[in-house]
């Protein structure tokens, strides 16, 4: 019987010779569960596994804990890869996280974290980040130290409110914090003074809702 070739992430896909951008099937080692992820094989040397994308407001990001756990949306468009997969992946080896942002004026910026991982579901997929560089702010817009993940049906934030209900979307809310890339998508000219938009404070300031976001990960030793 021929052995099935499987890839845990887009870096492995890239190293196997598949260097074209697109949707690929990924499988964690010692697992039969497959996920479909978009692989960026061009940006910064390629091999990036896209774990989140916002671009047009076509997908509802106000989802449940379970939906954020397993993932939702369309890997060719707007989607969330899934906290469980990302948690397991980032605990097997060291990953970097790159967050690419677009505003409505044609500008782009990024934040690069040299070490990124998510805790297990038992620890509410808490985010861990280290070593920020990039053009989207000298201070991390994801609160440090990292917070637990919250959704509309799982309130794990540090606020007297329920941040996920107030701001919409699942995120590592503080109270509520300087970012939320899973907030409401607002079109151009309706994207300022928003209390629940797609926010990255240390690049665009308060109330500015972004045009596009991509969160991508890659092994640190790629």
């Amino acid at each position: 019987k021929e052995e099935q070739i499987s890839f845990r992430d887009c870096a492995e896909v890239f190293k196997s010779g598949h260097t074209t951008n697109g949707v690929y099937t990924l499988t964690l080692p010692n697992s039969t569960e497959e996920v479909k992820a978009y692989c960026d094989m061009e940006a910064g040397g390629g091999g990036w596994t896209i774990i989140q994308r916002r671009e047009d407001g076509s997908v509802d990001f106000q989802r449940t804990w379970k939906e954020y756990k397993v993932g939702f949306g369309n890997p060719s468009g707007e989607y969330w890869l899934g906290n469980e997969f990302v948690s397991q992946l980032t605990n097997q080896q060291r990953y970097v996280l790159k967050i690419h942002l677009k505003d409505w004026e044609g500008n782009e910026a990024y934040s690069l974290y040299e070490h990124f991982y998510l805790s297990s579901e038992e620890l509410n997929y808490r985010i861990h980040l280290k070593g920020l560089t990039g053009t989207a702010g000298k201070i991390s817009s994801i609160s440090q130290p990292g917070n637990d993940f919250s959704t509309k049906d799982a309130d794990n934030d540090k606020c007297i409110c329920k941040c996920s209900q107030m701001l919409t979307g699942g995120w590592w809310f503080d109270a509520c914090g300087p970012s939320n890339l899973n907030g409401m998508y607002y079109p151009q000219r309706q994207n300022t003074n928003k209390f629940n938009g797609i926010k990255w404070y240390y690049w665009k300031g308060s109330g500015y809702s972004l045009k596009g976001t991509t969160m991508m990960i890659r092994p640190a030793d790629f």
Epitope: C161, C176, F195, S206
Partner: nanobody
Framework: EVQLVESGGGLVQAGGSLRLSCAAS????????IGWFRQAPGKEREGVSS????????YYADSVKGRFTISSDNDKNTVYLQMNSLKPEDTAVYYC??????????????????????WGQGTLVTVSS
């Protein structure tokens, strides 16, 4: 659409007074905190005063305590900043901003700058010596 419009700025002599107004639309003050901030040329934006809970809770920066008074008129959906005994160092553009009142960390009374998501365009206050 959420809008905040400041007015009342101007040129005043040291020791004089001004009253700034912040007219809010697109939301009601009942559920929001309003902050006054200022930014002098070449300096960071800093918090001056804040109000929430229909005036039940107010905050003042040490530099303006005893000189500035914040108040709100919920019928007019407007917040005021009465500034007395003005000093040349009070010269700045003054902004008002809004944040949902509930967006508070457990055990804390006020909000970091990044929580204020709606801002006005600002009004210039110049205090001459």
């Amino acid at each position: 659409e959420v809008q905040l419009v400041e007015s009342g700025g101007g040129l005043v002599q040291a020791g004089g007074s001004l009253r700034l107004s912040c007219a809010a639309s697109g939301f009601t003050l009942d559920d929001y905190a309003i902050g006054w901030f200022r930014q002098a040329p070449g300096k960071e934006r800093e918090g001056v005063s804040s109000i929430r809970d229909n005036g039940g809770s107010t905050y003042y920066a040490d530099s303006v305590k005893g000189r500035f008074t914040i108040s709100s008129d919920n019928d007019k959906n407007t917040v005021y900043l009465q500034m007395n005994s003005l000093k040349p160092e009070d010269t700045a553009v003054y902004y008002c901003a809004a944040v949902p009142a509930g967006r508070l960390r457990f055990g804390e009374q006020w909000y970091p700058l990044y929580e204020y998501d709606a801002w006005g365009q600002g009004t210039l206050v110049t205090v001459s010596s």
